[in-house]
């Protein structure tokens, strides 16, 4: 059975600032045909037929659901892109994470401006404080890491707070073993 393709993002963040660039790539097994990819944005077929879809100078209208399809293979699972206009944006490597998988959080400043005195919060409680800006790395996510995250920091010597982001960590499916 042909595998469903998978949409990946580069950079890996699905929440980006207006004006930023992101490349969506349709990955799958044995897809050698360069121009045989269909891209769907909010259900509408895109003109792009390459395996990569480049979003340059992102606009609010670029927000929404993206899916790809190779040949007559099933459509990929959807990927959701959200375009923001703000000073600070909390970005996550994924918003739904399988238990045991890594999770990365980034407090990103608009236009890549220097951000400092960064505090990450989970469910209203401060998690980490850095004078210089750093990403948070959770190497093995657990269900307890689920929650509402946001960050605060200084940009241009002024204090800002990001919009909150819900992270859900789900239990990995148990392998079933049958007695022979």
């Amino acid at each position: 059975v042909p595998q469903k393709p998978k949409v990946s993002l580069n950079p890996p963040w699905n929440r980006i600032f207006k004006g930023e660039n992101v490349t969506l790539t349709c990955n799958g097994n044995n897809f050698f045909e360069v121009s045989s990819t269909k891209w769907f944005h909010n259900g509408s077929l895109s003109e792009e037929t390459n395996s990569s879809l480049n979003i340059v100078n992102a606009k609010f209208e670029d927000s929404g659901e993206y899916k790809c399809q190779h040949q007559q293979v099933n459509e990929s699972e959807p990927v959701y892109l959200e375009v923001f206009s703000d000073w600070l944006l909390l970005q996550a490597s994924a918003e739904v994470v399988m238990e045991g998988q890594p999770l990365f959080l980034r407090c990103h400043g608009w236009r890549n401006w220097d951000v400092y005195k960064v505090i990450y919060y989970k469910d209203g409680e401060a998690l980490k404080y850095w004078y210089e800006n750093h990403n948070i790395s959770i190497t093995n996510a657990t269900v307890e890491d689920s929650g509402t995250y946001y960050c605060t920091g200084k940009v241009w010597q002024l204090d800002y707070e990001s919009e909150p982001l819900n992270i859900t960590v789900i239990k990995a499916p148990r392998e079933k073993y049958w007695l022979q």
């Epitope: 236009r111 890549n112 401006w113 220097d114 400092y116 004078y131 210089e132 241009w156 010597q157």
Partner: antibody
Framework: EVQLVQSGAEVKKPGSSVKVSCKAS????????ISWVRQAPGQGLEWMGR????????NYAQKFQGRVTITADKSTSTAYMELSSLRSEDTAVYYC??????????????WGQGTTVTVSS | DIQMTQSPSSVSASVGDRVTIPCRAS??????LAWYQQKPGKAPKLLIY???NLQSGVPSRFSGSGSGTDFTLTISSLQPEDSATYYC?????????FGGGTKVEIK
């Protein structure tokens, strides 16, 4: 390479206003800010305020609040600093400087040549 | 306001000497500090940003160190053209403040 070119020397009467311009040549303001710094004769450097042209947001040192106005015209890549109610203590060289927010921790990496403002009756 | 203190206000040294110029912040500013050189009648020039990063085009004899409240600008081997006034500046919070300056003279 960006250069900041300031307007010429000014002689002003006490109580009047002065407006100094700062034009970016060889580049635009882009995502940078422009700070204004003054230096009285034989004295050190004093930060007055700054503007982020792309946003039109200006911030001022408390000392100058209400007396200084910093503006920018993105179309001509020019920043302006207007100081009102001039007094003799405002006699100084006024500098504009580009503030770099890209890994420079907001240091001022490009400076104008300075504009001498003399306040005298 | 964060006060920046530079002491001494002047230092005299010979060509080839190692010169250190201290700067102290009245509260912690991590690495949010810049150093500038100003020669008479000229605009200041950025030497060091983020406390220890050398600005492009600045000779490697200049270096910056420190974090928190205590910072140092070092000229490893003083040259005649280094005769100038050196200012530190904190970029952490409003109002942005400069030290009073340290004048370096050649003996």
């Amino acid at each position: 390479e960006v250069q900041l070119v300031q307007s010429g020397a000014e002689v002003k009467k006490p109580g009047s206003s002065v407006k100094v311009s700062c034009k970016a040549s060889g580049g635009t303001f882009s995502s940078y800010a422009i700070s204004w710094v003054r230096q009285a004769p034989g004295q050190g450097l004093e930060w007055m305020g700054r503007i982020i042209p792309i946003l039109g947001i200006a911030n001022y040192a408390q000392k100058f609040q209400g007396r200084v106005t910093i503006t920018a015209d993105k179309s001509t890549s020019t920043a302006y600093m207007e100081l009102s109610s001039l007094r003799s203590e405002d006699t100084a060289v006024y500098y504009c400087a580009r503030v770099n927010p890209f890994g420079y921790y907001y240091a001022m990496d490009v400076w104008g040549q300075g504009t001498t403002v003399t306040v005298s009756s | 306001d964060i006060q920046m203190t530079q002491s001494p206000s002047s230092v005299s040294a010979s060509v080839g000497d190692r010169v250190t110029i201290p700067c102290r912040a009245s509260q912690g500013i991590s690495s949010w500090l810049a150093w500038y050189q100003q020669k008479p009648g000229k605009a200041p020039k950025l030497l060091i940003y983020a406390a220890s990063n050398l600005q492009s085009g600045v000779p490697s004899r200049f270096s910056g160190s420190g974090s928190g409240t205590d910072f140092t600008l070092t000229i490893s081997s003083l040259q005649p053209e280094d005769s100038a006034t050196y200012y530190c500046q904190q970029t952490d919070s409003f109002p942005l403040t400069f030290g009073g300056g340290t004048k370096v003279e050649i003996k």
